[in-house]
Interface confidence: low
């Protein structure tokens, strides 16, 4: 951004009203008026080129410094060529000297040369020769000098003539400011340019309305150079949540849009299942019945708990049940559905019901299931079971309603006993069996049926309350078909599969375990 100039003194604009002090009084510098373009112009001129040892001073009025640290002095002047005077005027000069003096008060007409410090010798780039002068075509020179740092309340400038023919048309004194600036959504105030050329004044910016420094970001800063130029921007501001960048400002998100954090991104349209947001929304409120899980980004549509599992079946197989279901018809808009299975049992005789608790076994842990089936085993015979399968997702915890479906099943038979041959001889077979412990209390007796293989006309039955039996009076080297069935108060349970066991031949040794 271009530097801004603040004028402290402008001789040309003052119309001869300034009344500068000349020394010695009445000699040397003189205020003159000319007409240019039908306008009066004023100038201080001196032209004592024929006399030697000139020391003519022109001092400005006292200039209040204000906030300036470094001042710039722009001079517009003409200098006549010494050769344009008769004999070349041996004492003639073509330069003059520029001085300044700082003071805290106006000394008025009390002029003391010793208080002044030389700034520079001012030499023209172009001198006005005789022919130019006669044609009223003077060569105007422009020179600029700067002084700083200034520390007192005010200052004077002085021009020392040492024998030149000079006309001073314009003296303009100003200081420079870096102008007010909006950059990177930060406002930088108008700042006085520093006084030291190498140094850059660091200026802190303030974020525009509704802009903030991003977390971990640098505060906005710029550097104001001596010439009033802004340099080296550092850091930036971003539009805060609910606002987006529009040119150099942060504008509230329009209704129906939102922005959830300070960022460079624009406002986003409210996602599905949100209400029309008001202006400046940082998020879009969910529709009634829809929610956001804590980990959901604001840009994600609002979601709701799933509906119940769509279709649930419980297929009994002896003392086992396979539960199968299909996913909810409405997922709630989420993919993080999990299922949990709970179980109740009811005694038909008493009508009592209670939790299954530890009396059943699941093929996998019954909570947090992602598959849509599970097998429940170790069920008791002649018991009614109710299974509840609940579907949940990431927002189910935000509402009190739950999404579940139930299925009931009656277990009419015990689990088939698992049968093994414990030992055998030429005339006997020792057989044992087991059933799940929860079912054992329901069993009254076990019935063991056996017959010779291939003889379908006759079979033998043995009943026992225990878990083993020895079958005697068997034929040697003969295969028998053996089946065990539990008997409950309500009738027969499921029978075991039919096993083939063979007695030993007479040559074999007795009672060998198979």
């Amino acid at each position: 951004a271009q530097g801004k100039e603040v004028v402290l003194l402008d001789f040309a604009a003052a119309g001869g009203e300034l009344g500068w002090l000349t020394h010695p009084y009445g000699k040397g510098w003189d205020l003159m008026q000319n007409i240019m373009n039908d306008m009066p112009i004023y100038m201080y001129s001196v032209c004592n080129v024929m006399s030697g040892d000139q020391d003519n001073w022109l001092r400005t009025n006292w200039v209040y410094r204000g906030e300036a640290e470094r001042i710039f002095i722009e001079l517009k002047f003409t200098v006549r060529d010494c050769n344009s005077f008769p004999g070349g005027a041996s004492s003639c000069k073509e330069t003059f000297n520029l001085y300044y003096a700082e003071s805290d008060l106006d000394y008025g007409t009390n002029f003391q040369k010793r208080l002044f410090t030389k700034i520079d010798t001012i030499a023209p780039d172009e001198i006005t020769v005789s022919s130019d002068f006669e044609a009223r075509h003077v060569k105007l020179n422009v020179e600029e000098r700067s002084v700083g740092p200034l520390t007192r309340k005010g200052f004077y400038l002085a021009f020392q003539d040492i024998g030149a023919c000079v006309a001073l048309l314009s003296v303009r004194v100003y200081y420079k400011k870096c102008p007010e600036l909006l950059q990177g959504l930060a406002h930088f105030p108008e700042t006085i340019a520093g006084s030291d050329a190498p140094s850059l004044a660091t200026v802190a910016g303030t974020c525009v309305d509704h802009a903030v420094v991003p977390p971990g970001g640098e505060e906005p800063r710029m550097h104001c150079a001596v010439d009033g130029e802004w340099l080296v921007p550092i850091g930036q501001c971003l539009c805060q949540a609910g606002y987006e960048k529009v040119e150099d400002a942060c504008q509230a998100c329009s209704p129906g849009f939102f922005k959830f954090e300070a960022s460079e991104s624009p406002c986003l349209e409210c996602p599905e299942h949100t209400l029309p947001s008001p202006e400046g929304a940082t998020s879009c409120e969910c529709e009634e019945g829809f929610f956001r899980a804590p980990q959901d980004p604001a840009s994600m549509p609002c979601t709701r708990p799933p509906s119940a599992p769509h279709y649930l079946t419980a297929v009994g197989m002896g003392a086992k049940v396979e539960l199968r279901w299909t996913p909810p018809q409405d997922s709630g808009g989420r993919e993080d559905i999990v299922y949990s299975v709970t179980c109740e049992q009811c005694w038909p005789e008493s009508g009592e019901c209670g939790p299954c608790e530890a009396s059943v076994r699941y093929s996998e842990p019954p909570h947090g299931l992602t598959r849509t089936s599970v097998t429940v085993s170790d069920l008791e015979p002649h018991m009614n079971y109710t299974f509840t399968v609940e579907a949940r997702n990431g927002v189910s915890g935000l509402v009190t309603s739950r999404s579940f479906r139930t299925a009931s099943v009656s277990i009419n038979q015990t689990e088939p006993p698992k049968v093994r041959l414990e030992g055998r001889s030429t005339t006997s077979l020792s057989v044992s069996w087991s059933i799940p412990p929860p079912q054992q209390s329901r069993v009254w007796k076990y019935e063991v049926t056996y017959r010779k293989k291939g003889d379908s006309n006759s079979y033998n039955v043995r009943r026992t309350e225990g878990f083993s039996v020895t079958l005697d009076d068997l034929a040697p080297d003969t295969t028998y078909l053996v089946q065990v069935q539990a008997l409950t108060q309500e009738g027969q349970g499921a029978g075991s599969k039919v096993h083939e066991f063979q007695t030993l031949s007479p040559e074999g040794s007795g009672n060998l375990a198979v």
Partner: antibody, heavy 118, light 111 residues
Framework: QIQLVQSGPELKKPGETVKISCKAS????????MNWVKQAPGKGLKWMGW????????TYADDFKGRFVFSLETSASTAYLQINNLKNEDMATYFC???????????WGQGTTLTVSS | DVVMTQTPLSLPVSLGDQASISCRSS???????????LHWYLQKPGQSPKLLIY???NRFSGVPDRFSGSGSGTDFTLKISRVEAEDLGVYFC????????FGSGTKLEIK
């Protein structure tokens, strides 16, 4: 400019019904939730609930479930508060208030004073 | 419900003085979004409440900058840097992080 203009004062007997209106102007009615706030004489402010003007869904604070009904006439940009079976403790000034954000209110109606007296 | 406790109940001030009103909540008002939904209203006699400050420190449009809000968690303060005659009335704090509730009010009056 944005305005919420409520119906005038009401004098009712216990057991009667009152319906207070709140007419909105100067903004898109359906873009802002409308809340209702009760101020009993010499008492503080008590939030009664709000109505989602976009979908017409009312939400009631626990103390205002039952006899209180929020409703809308969207075409007229008007919200209503109806109180059934008036009781003495319903005597108060009722304000409608537009929601700037979740339950903070940038514009309020001038209030409707309800006197319940037998 | 969250209880909002305001102190003092009455605040006599001289015009031009600074005034400070405190509001304490029975639960933290930090919302899951990270925002704190604590607001201040002014109710002048015979008028409806007017929003002054929302979300702790956001001054509402048209509210003079002599009003400022600060605080976090459960403790909040409304400051008026130089009280003017038009500032007199009852100030209410309110929270909407949970079910909305209001403080009992602080009456600002001339000393």
């Amino acid at each position: 400019q944005i305005q919420l203009v409520q119906s005038g004062p009401e004098l009712k007997k216990p057991g009667e019904t009152v319906k207070i209106s709140c007419k909105a102007s100067g903004f898109t009615f359906t873009n802002y939730g409308m809340n209702w706030v009760k101020q009993a004489p010499g008492k503080g402010l008590k939030w009664m609930g709000w109505i989602n003007t976009y979908i017409g869904e009312p939400t009631y604070a626990d103390d205002f479930k039952g006899r209180f009904v929020f409703s809308l006439e969207t075409s007229a940009s008007t919200a209503y508060l109806q109180i059934n079976n008036l009781k003495n403790e319903d005597m108060a000034t009722y304000f409608c208030a537009r929601e700037l954000g979740p339950y903070y209110f940038d514009y309020w109606g001038q209030g409707t004073t309800l006197t319940v007296s037998s | 419900d969250v209880v909002m406790t305001q102190t003092p109940l009455s605040l006599p001030v001289s015009l031009g003085d600074q005034a400070s009103i405190s509001c304490r909540s029975s639960q933290s008002l930090v919302h899951s979004s990270g925002n704190t939904y604590l607001h201040w209203y002014l109710q002048k006699p015979g008028q409806s409440p007017k929003l002054l400050i929302y979300k702790v420190s956001n001054r509402f449009s048209g509210v003079p900058d002599r009003f400022s809000g600060s605080g976090s968690g459960t403790d909040f303060t409304l400051k008026i840097s130089r009280v003017e005659a038009e500032d007199l009335g009852v100030y209410f704090c309110s929270q909407s992080t949970h079910v909305p509730t209001f403080g009992s009010g602080t009456k600002l009056e001339i000393k």
